[in-house]
């Protein structure tokens, strides 16, 4: 049997026998275009493609539409994988989304959605989510039904304000909504009473900016 040389996600890599967490090269569906991603092969059985990570404020997340489309940062540290790749990938098969959160007091929580996909760019990468479980709130901190993605130069929210400019970062803003994991990074002791921080309302409430976040996806049938 021929060894598989291209992989569409980290689940395929895991199933091929490569089970060490790290940076791997993925290929866009139906294309030869490649992208580097961090694969988490340890959490909950492994095979997770990390699509977002925050940990120290080393990367500026107040980026343009093009940058959020194509991805930015370093897969070894803080990064955004890219809306176009995620949209194409999640449009092909059913994926689950796991969001892992850390606060400044040493607590961890997660939200798991049993179906996640992004619409195409023509629909502003609108987010679709169903089936929430987990410890980071019984109500979804990503507004339901899903919103369009907005950035500082592409305002697609439901607000008379520009949420991305007001709150910082590209996100699926409502008006503006209960979350923003791409907000301004605030260090410990400066992370409360912040309107534009890294917010997951139904876990930590208003004004609390989180220490670390990871968004990762995996096929539902993994």
């Amino acid at each position: 049997k021929e060894e598989q040389t291209t992989f569409r996600d980290c689940a395929e890599i895991f199933k091929s026998g490569l089970t060490t967490s790290g940076i791997y090269t993925l290929t866009f569906p139906n294309s030869t275009e490649e992208i580097k991603a961090y694969c988490d092969m340890d959490v909950g059985g492994g095979g997770w493609t990390v699509i977002q990570h925050r940990e120290d404020g080393s990367v500026d997340f107040q980026r343009t539409w093009k940058e959020y489309k194509e991805g930015f940062g370093s897969p070894l540290g803080e990064y955004w994988l890219g809306n176009e790749f995620v949209s194409q990938l999640t449009g092909q098969h059913r994926y689950v989304l796991k969001i892992q959160l850390k606060d400044w007091e040493g607590n961890e929580a997660h939200s798991l959605y049993d179906h996640f996909y992004l619409a195409g760019e023509e629909s502003n990468y609108r987010i679709h989510l169903t089936g929430l479980t987990g410890t980071a709130g019984k109500i979804s901190s990503i507004s339901q039904p899903g919103s369009d993605f907005s950035t500082k130069d592409s305002d697609n929210d439901k607000c008379i304000c520009k949420c991305s400019q007001m709150l910082s970062g590209g996100w699926w803003f409502d008006a503006c909504g209960p979350s923003n994991l791409n907000g301004q990074y605030y260090p410990q002791k400066q992370n409360t009473n912040k309107f534009n921080g890294i917010k997951w309302y139904y876990w930590k409430g208003s004004g609390y900016s989180l220490k670390a976040t990871t968004m990762m996806i995996r096929p539902a049938d993994f």
Epitope: K158, C159, I160, M166, A175, P178, N193, K194, F195
Partner: nanobody
């Protein structure tokens, strides 16, 4: 630094009245909507009323409509919640909170409404206790 300080809470008999005050500082008052939320023991925090002094937009929870009135004094950077015909179920800690007035949908602006969704509010006071006995 943003500060919201509530006062005016206390104990009252059912049918009585109280006036809560929220003194705001650290931001341009006219640019913000001020909300009142409450939390009773063992219950979720709920929106009571809000006001945007720049355009007079207000909103009330169904449970307090016709009994509570919100108003603002821009000169004093203070918002008031006049509570009449109080009921035992109004017993709670009442919080004052603030959100930029522009953080609204066009539909809300057309309807002259402000947010009663607590997740939109960024800044919170420490709260004042209201106890209504029968």
């Amino acid at each position: 630094e943003v500060q919201l300080v509530e006062s005016g809470g206390g104990s009252v008999q059912a049918g009585g009245s109280l006036r809560l005050s929220c003194a705001a500082s650290g931001f341009t008052f006219d640019d913000y909507a001020i909300g009142w939320f409450r939390q009773a023991p063992g219950k979720e925090r709920e929106g009571v009323s809000c006001i945007s002094s720049s355009d007079g937009s207000t909103n009330y929870a169904d449970s307090v409509k016709g009994r509570f009135t919100i108003s603002s004094d821009t000169a004093k950077n203070t918002v008031y919640l006049q509570m009449n015909s109080l009921k035992p179920e109004d017993t709670a800690v009442y919080y004052c909170t603030a959100v930029p007035a522009t953080r609204r949908t066009p539909q809300m602006v057309d309807a002259n409404m402000c947010w009663l969704a607590e997740y939109e509010y960024d800044y919170w006071g420490q709260g004042t206790q209201v106890t209504v006995s029968s």
